[in-house]
C-alpha cells in the first residue's frame, strides 16, 4: 500500500533550488529501482517533478495560495520489468500554505458620505470595508483591524466593522462644510509587521436650520410717488440666514405700523429677498411718512434647535411718499341741479367746487365742455363754479341737460379734471290742453234727445305734480240755445250730447262747436278746439247712409240708432 | 424693456430632436428663473419647464409629460435659455414660449412671440 | 399637482354687460401664486392680473381679480369689444398649471 500523508508547501518560496514537497512511497518498494513511480493531474511534469526511482517530489515554480491553494494529483508506482501497477492508482493533495503576503483592500479607493452638521457624537456617518486576500482560517494574515490616520477629533471609526461616526460635539456646517478622513485597514490583527492598505472618505455636513435670519441693518427707507398703483414694488430688503437651501428660505411678514393695511411684504422666489409692495392707494396730502416693522422668519424650523432663540429678525422700514401734481378733484363724483323753465336769462342753477389737492393748493378756474352744451345754453363763473343760464328754457323740448364742467388749475393747465353736471328742468304750467286728436262726428237725423254722440279726450305738454285735471264746456258764445250739450266727465274726458229730437240735413247740414278745454294748474291755461257734427241719413240701426258733404269718410260718432 | 426672442423651432419627424433657444434682455437675467410654456394648435396653455437661478444650483422642473426627454438649461454670461428636446412624439406640436416671471418670480409676467415646432412623419 | 378648474368654458356677452369668471383650485393656495392672462387670437398671452388682484401695468381698471383659498374670479365691470379674448387662471406652486380657459365672446 501507499505510505504518505498529506503535502504541505509554502506560497511564494524564493530559494534558488527546487522546492521539495515530499515522498510517494510504496511498501512494495524494496528500493532497488524496480518499480518506477509516475505522477498525473494539477501540474504534474511543469509545476511539479517526481523522481522516478525514488518517489521524491518537487516544485519547479514558485506557487501563489491566493492563485490556487490545492493541488490534486495522481500517484502509480509500477514494476518496470512486468510494466503492471504494483499499487492502485491513487490521488492525493498538495495543499499551499500561506503566508501573509496580501495586505488589505478597500472596496472603494474613495468613499462619499454625508451626516448632519451639529450631529450628536456616535452618530453613524459611513462603514468602510476592507478585504484580504490571505488565508481568513489560518493564523491572522486576513484579520483586518480599522485605523483613522486623518480625521480627528473628528471622526472615529470602529477597529472591528469600519464603521465611521462623529466624535466631536457641534460640528457647524457654516464654520467647516467638508472634511477629509483616511482609513488605514491593517492584517494580522492590527500588529507589528501586519500589511495595511487606506482609502479616503469625503465626508460633508449637510445643513440643519440651525441659523435664524438676520437683517444686516435695523432700518431701511424707501420712497414712493402716491401715484402708485397697487402692486407696486417699492423697495427690497434681504435677512441673511447661513443656512442653505430649504433652512435659509425666508418668509417676510410686516407685523406692526401704520402701513400695516397700506403696504404689503413678499418674498422673491428665487433671491429670498423681501419685496416691498403698495397694497392700496397712497395720498400725500393725507400722509407723507409711514412707518413698519418687518419681520423675515425660516418657515422650516428645526425644534431641537429652539433653545438658540426664535428663528426671526425684525427691521423698520421706513417709507416715504413723494408728492405727485394732482388734478383738481371735485366735491361730487356728479352734479344733480334743478331750475324751473321760466327762469329768466342769467338765472343761477347752483354751483361746484373742485381743489387742488397738492398741498399747493394751486387756484382753480371753471369751465363748460362746450362739446356737451353745443346750444351754450349754460354758463359758470370761471372763478366760483356758480352754474347760470345764457338763454330761455323749455322743458317741453328738453327735460334734461347732461353737461361737463372742467376744472383746471390756473398755474398748470395739464392738470384739469371734468365732472358731470345733470340739469333738471322743472315744469311750469306754460302751455293749453288742446284736443287729443281732430273731431268730426255725425249726428243722424232721427236721433234723440241725451244721446252721446262723441267723447272727447285732452292732452297737455305740461307736467303737473299731481296730474292733469282738464275741465270741459262750450265757448260762451255756443253756450246758449246750442243742439247740442257737453257733459264734463271729471275724468279728463267729455261728452257731446245731442239736445233735441231730431235734425234736418236740409236746414243745417254741419255744426260747428267751440269746446273750451281748461286746466287746473297755475296759471289756469285753456284752449277752445272746434268740433265738427254732420247731420246725416242713417238706417233703422243708426248707421249713417248718407250725409250732405260726403266727403265724410271716417266718423267718430258712436251709433244713434234707436 | 423687457424682450424675449425663441428660436430654433421647426418641423421634426418623431423621435427626432431640436434645440430651443431664447435670447433676453433688458432685465437682469440673472435674478429670475425662467420658463417654457407651450401651447398646442387650437388647444389651451401648458407649461413645460422651469430652470431657477444659480443662488439655487440652477435647480430644474418638468412637466410629467416631458421628463426625461426635455432638458431646460441656462447661460447667464449670455442671457440665453434652451430646451433640448428629445425622443419627440406627435403631442409635442406646439407653440413653444420662453417666459419670463414678474418681479419676486411670481406668475408669468413677459412672454416671447413663440416658435413653432412640429412634430410629424 | 394642482389643477385648476375654469368656468364657464365659453360665454357671450354683450358690450356693458358684467362678465365673471371664476377658478378653482383643487386644494388651497397662497393668493400671491395665483394669476390671471388674457389670449387674443394670434397673440402670446399677456399677464392681467397678478397675485390675485393686482393690475397688470396698461391694464384698465375695469378688470379685478379677487378669491383666497380653492376659489377665485376676474371680473370685468362692464364688457368691451376689445375684451373678447380667452381668459386663464394660473398657479406657481411646480408643477405650475393652468386652467383650461374661458372664450369671451360678443353676443
Known amino acids: 500500500s501507499w505510505m504518505w500523508n498529506q503535502f504541505f508547501l509554502l506560497e511564494e518560496y524564493t530559494g534558488s533550488d527546487y522546492q521539495y514537497v515530499g515522498k510517494l512511497h510504496s511498501d512494495q518498494d524494496r528500493g532497488d529501482g524496480s518499480l518506477k513511480y509516475i505522477l498525473s493531474g494539477d501540474g504534474a511534469g511543469d509545476l511539479f517533478i517526481i523522481n522516478e526511482n525514488t518517489g521524491d517530489i518537487q516544485a519547479t515554480k514558485r506557487l501563489d495560495r491566493e492563485e490556487k491553494p490545492v493541488y490534486i494529483l495522481r500517484a502509480q508506482a509500477i514494476n518496470r520489468r512486468t510494466g503492471r501497477p504494483v499499487e492502485p492508482e491513487s490521488e492525493f493533495i498538495i495543499k499551499i500554505h500561506d503566508i501573509n503576503d496580501n495586505e488589505p483592500i478597500f472596496t472603494k479607493e474613495v468613499y462619499t458620505a454625508t451626516v448632519p452638521e451639529m450631529s450628536d457624537v456616535g452618530t453613524f456617518v459611513v462603514q468602510v470595508t476592507a478585504t484580504d486576500a490571505d488565508d481568513p482560517t489560518y493564523g491572522n494574515s486576513a484579520k483586518v483591524v480599522y485605523s483613522i490616520l486623518q480625521g480627528q477629533p473628528y471622526f472615529s471609526v470602529e477597529s472591528e466593522t469600519g464603521i465611521i461616526k462623529t466624535a466631536l460635539l457641534n460640528m457647524d456646517r457654516e464654520n467647516r462644510e467638508q472634511y477629509q478622513v483616511v482609513i488605514q485597514a491593517k492584517d494580522m490583527g492590527g500588529q507589528m509587521g501586519g500589511l495595511s492598505g487606506t482609502t479616503t472618505v469625503n465626508i460633508t455636513l449637510t445643513d440643519v436650520n440651525d441659523n435664524p435670519p438676520r437683517f444686516p441693518q435695523s432700518t431701511y427707507q424707501f420712497k414712493t410717488p402716491e401715484s402708485s398703483p397697487p402692486g407696486t414694488p417699492i423697495g427690497r430688503i434681504k435677512a441673511s440666514d447661513a443656512d442653505v437651501g430649504e433652512n435659509a428660505e425666508i418668509e417676510y411678514s410686516i407685523t406692526d405700523g401704520e402701513g400695516l393695511d397700506m403696504f404689503d411684504v413678499i418674498t422673491d422666489q428665487e433671491t429670498q429677498e423681501g419685496i416691498i409692495t403698495v397694497k392700496k392707494l397712497l395720498d400725500f396730502e393725507k400722509k407723507k411718512v409711514y412707518t413698519l416693522k418687518v419681520e423675515a422668519s425660516n418657515p422650516h424650523v428645526e425644534p431641537r434647535f429652539l433653545y438658540l432663540g426664535p428663528f426671526k429678525d425684525s427691521a423698520t422700514v421706513r417709507i416715504v411718499v413723494e408728492d405727485v401734481d394732482e388734478p383738481p378733484v371735485f366735491s361730487k363724483l356728479a352734479y344733480i341741479l334743478q331750475i324751473r323753465e321760466d327762469a329768466q336769462i342769467n338765472t343761477t342753477i347752483g354751483s361746484v367746487t373742485a381743489q387742488d389737492p397738492d398741498a399747493a393748493r394751486n387756484p382753480v378756474k371753471y369751465s363748460v365742455d362746450r362739446h356737451t352744451d353745443m346750444d351754450r345754453i349754460f354758463n359758470i363763473d370761471s372763478g366760483n363754479g356758480s352754474i347760470f343760464t345764457s338763454k330761455l328754457l323749455d322743458r317741453e323740448t328738453l327735460l334734461w341737460h347732461n353737461i361737463t364742467v372742467i376744472a383746471t388749475e390756473i398755474n398748470n393747465p395739464k392738470q384739469s379734471s371734468r365732472v358731470p353736471l345733470y340739469i333738471k328742468v322743472l315744469d311750469v304750467n306754460d302751455n293749453a290742453p288742446e284736443f287729443a286728436e281732430f273731431y268730426e262726428t255725425f249726428v243722424c237725423e232721427k236721433a234723440k234727445a241725451d244721446q252721446l254722440i262723441q267723447t272727447l279726450r285732452a292732452v297737455d305738454k305740461d307736467d303737473p305734480y299731481s296730474g292733469h285735471q282738464f275741465s270741459f264746456s262750450l265757448a260762451p258764445e255756443a253756450a246758449s240755445g246750442s243742439n247740442f250739450t257737453i257733459q264734463d266727465n271729471k275724468d279728463n274726458t267729455a261728452g257731446i250730447l245731442t239736445r233735441k229730437n231730431g235734425y234736418n240735413r236740409h236746414e243745417m247740414s254741419t255744426y260747428l262747436l267751440p269746446v273750451v278745454i281748461s286746466d287746473n294748474d297755475y296759471p289756469v291755461q285753456s284752449s277752445t278746439g272746434t268740433v265738427t257734427v254732420r247731420v246725416c241719413a242713417c238706417d233703422h240701426h243708426g248707421n249713417m247712409q248718407s250725409c250732405h258733404a260726403e266727403a265724410l269718410i271716417h266718423p267718430t260718432g258712436l251709433s244713434t240708432g234707436a | 424693456e423687457v424682450h424675449l426672442v425663441e428660436s430654433g423651432g421647426g418641423l421634426v419627424q418623431p423621435k427626432g430632436s431640436l434645440k430651443l433657444s431664447c435670447v433676453a434682455s433688458?432685465?437682469?437675467?440673472?435674478?429670475?428663473?425662467m420658463n417654457w410654456v407651450r401651447q398646442a394648435p387650437g388647444k389651451g396653455l401648458e407649461w413645460v419647464a422651469r430652470?431657477?437661478?444659480?443662488?439655487?444650483?440652477?435647480?430644474?422642473y418638468y412637466a410629467d409629460s416631458v421628463t426625461d426627454r426635455f432638458t431646460i438649461s441656462r447661460d447667464d454670461s449670455q442671457s440665453m435659455l434652451y430646451l433640448q428636446m428629445n425622443n419627440l412624439k406627435t403631442e409635442d406640436t406646439a407653440m413653444y414660449y420662453c417666459?419670463?416671471?414678474?418681479?419676486?418670480?411670481?406668475?408669468?409676467?413677459?412672454w416671447g412671440q413663440g416658435t413653432l415646432v412640429t412634430v410629424s412623419a | 399637482e394642482i389643477v385648476l378648474t375654469q368656468s364657464p368654458t365659453t360665454m357671450a356677452a354683450s358690450p356693458g354687460e358684467k362678465i365673471t369668471i371664476t377658478c378653482s383650485a383643487s386644494s388651497s393656495i397662497s393668493s400671491h401664486y395665483l394669476h390671471w392672462y388674457q389670449q387674443k387670437p394670434g397673440f402670446s398671452p399677456k399677464l392681467l392680473i397678478y397675485r390675485s388682484f393686482y393690475l397688470a401695468s396698461g391694464v384698465p381698471l375695469r378688470f379685478t381679480g379677487s378669491g383666497s383659498g380653492t376659489s377665485y374670479s376676474l371680473t370685468i365691470g362692464t364688457m368691451e369689444a376689445e375684451d373678447v379674448a380667452t381668459y386663464y387662471c394660473q398657479q406657481d406652486i411646480v408643477p405650475l398649471t393652468f386652467g383650461a380657459g374661458t372664450k369671451l365672446e360678443l353676443k
Open positions: 430652470i431657477r437661478i444659480k443662488n439655487n444650483n440652477y435647480a430644474t
Open positions: 417666459v419670463r416671471p414678474d418681479y419676486g418670480n411670481y406668475g408669468l409676467a413677459y
Open positions: 433688458g432685465f437682469t437675467f440673472t435674478t429670475y428663473a
